[in-house]
């Protein structure tokens, strides 16, 4: 004997987030009389999605005119799909009863899978700066994607990195997923202009991966090299002592001159010159009146860079000897000038 069948022809339907899902259902008979309902999930905890007989379901529209007497098409459309809508949907025929309708037959179910794009990857570096030759960790995070399959790559200046670990969470079934990756990068003195890139590829992106970047300028600290030199000036009783501060990054730098251990002057790097690699040079000088000194003078250039412990370089100024050139540096970057006469 023929009996009503509830046909859900699609075992699965894949829809992009934000789009409309069509869930097809045909009841093969007008007998028995009674409404159709749609549920997500099975069993006592199932969620009512649409009831032909009553209720308000603003996201659901019927494909056919389901209230018409001869209608056997109970397909529905669900608008503005989100990952939270994923699940198995059942079209269920009820037999008219008193006082309540009785479930008569269910379709086999249609699994709705939602394709959701990953969020833009966010790359974060270490909280504190690190110096060249040190290894630092970068993290990359992206959220809200579905299905779970995803590819993540790391690059430094276009070169793919291999030292990284990636996790996709959760491990089990979920409406959407997150990816977290940590890459290790060894810093070099040339990395001020370098970039670390995290690239995420997913089926929803149609071959156009998302990228997150971090500038190593936010991460690296290149400590300065110091050189103190003495140069004569036209006046025979004066000597120019120069402290060349080279190849430092970031710019935050404070320089202190010491005479025989006593603070003479403190200044902050201002008019610096930038090197091609992004590091900075700066120069400070003292104009020393040697006739005012009976004994030799120990001049110290002390530099505190980016809040780190000070580094210093000293120069012994012989006052007994006739001043003569004891060193020179006329490099083009010596544009910063600061004078100090000692009497």
């Amino acid at each position: 004997e023929e009996e009503l069948q509830v046909i859900q022809p699609d075992k699965s339907v894949l829809v992009a987030a934000g789009e409309t899902a069509t869930l097809r259902c045909t009841a093969t008979s007008l007998i028995p009389v009674g409404p159709i309902q749609w549920f997500r999930g099975a069993g006592p905890g199932r969620e009512l999605i649409y009831n032909q007989k009553e209720g308000h379901f603003p996201r659901v529209t019927t494909v056919s005119e389901s209230t018409k007497r001869k209608n056997m098409d109970f397909s529905i459309r669900i608008g503005n799909i989100t990952p939270a809508d994923a699940g198995t949907y059942y079209c269920v025929k009820f037999r008219k009863g008193s006082p309540d309708d009785v479930e008569f037959k269910s379709g086999a179910g249609t699994e709705l899978s939602v394709r959701a794009k990953p969020s833009a990857p966010v790359v974060s570096g270490p909280a504190a700066r690190a110096t060249p030759q040190h290894t630092v960790s970068f993290t990359c995070e992206s959220h809200g994607f579905s299905p779970r399959d995803i590819t993540l790559k790391w690059f430094k200046n276009g070169n793919e990195l291999s030292d990284f670990q990636t996790n996709v969470d959760p491990v089990g079934e979920s409406v959407s997923y997150s990816i977290h990756s940590t890459a290790k990068v060894v810093l070099t003195r040339e990395d001020v202009h370098s970039q670390v890139i995290c690239e995420v590829a997913h089926v929803t992106l149609q071959g156009d991966p998302l990228r997150g970047t971090a500038n190593l300028s936010e991460t690296i600290r290149v400590p300065p090299t110091l050189e103190v030199t003495q140069q004569p000036v036209r006046a025979e009783n004066q000597v120019n002592v120069t402290c060349q501060v080279r190849k430092f990054y970031p710019q935050r730098l404070q320089l202190t001159w010491l005479e025989n251990g006593n603070v003479s002057r403190t200044e902050t790097a201002s008019t610096v010159t930038e090197n091609k690699d992004g590091t900075y040079n700066w120069m400070s000088w003292l104009l020393v009146n040697v006739s005012a000194h009976r004994d030799d003078v120990k001049l110290t250039c002390q530099v505190e860079h980016d809040g780190q412990p000070a580094v210093s370089k000293s120069h012994d100024l012989k006052v007994s000897a006739h001043p003569k050139e004891q060193g020179s540096n006329t490099a083009a970057e010596n544009t910063g000038s600061n004078e100090r006469n000692i009497y």
Partner: antibody
Framework: QVQLQESGPGLVKPSQTLSLTCTVS??????????WSWIRQHPGKGLEWIGY???????YYNPSLKSRVTISVDTSKNQFSLKLSSVTAADTAVYYC?????????????WGQGTLVTVSS | DIQLTQSPSSLSASVGDRVTITCQAS??????LNWYQQKPGKAPKLLIY???NLETGVPSRFSGSGSGTDFTFTISSLQPEDIATYYC?????????FGGGTKVEIK
Amino acid sequence: QVQLQESGPGLVKPSQTLSLTCTVSGGSISSGGYYWSWIRQHPGKGLEWIGYIYYSGSTYYNPSLKSRVTISVDTSKNQFSLKLSSVTAADTAVYYCAREGLDGSYGSSAWGQGTLVTVSS
Amino acid sequence: DIQLTQSPSSLSASVGDRVTITCQASQDISNYLNWYQQKPGKAPKLLIYDASNLETGVPSRFSGSGSGTDFTFTISSLQPEDIATYYCQQFAYLPYTFGGGTKVEIK
């Protein structure tokens, strides 16, 4: 008053695909309220229901023909079509398109005049 | 599929006679039954819908009755223009099916 008109080749070779179009005039397919059906009648025999389509594209096909049948709709042209693949001599018949009222009060309330399709090499 | 058995398969009657055709369904189809008239070389024409309702414009000599599995179609006074083949059709179950037809002739 709605009128339906079938069109398509009257002769189809065995193993090929039979293609027919039904043009609806005097009413819009997309206005809803009807299934748009195909029915055939073998020479000197009774009527066989092939299947229907709703303007939204929902279909149902007779299981005896399901693997070979496709019914589609083009609301912009106010037409619906039948494709029957891998035909044999047993598919020789007069093919009718018809309108089936969903509210039950008119049944297949409008039919085309029918077109004879012969399957022969 | 629902089987519809029409009887007789053909009949011959005189003008003015009462003609009765039966249609038996293989199972309960409630009142989801139509009756069609088909004249030679023409498309079927709906006469009766929902087992007993007369389609608009159809002469009142045609009538239908029945529910469940047994249905009857009657022409109360046969007219020459009624020469045709008559079919019952059920729409309670998919696929829709037709009876084998009853050919009505004039004696």
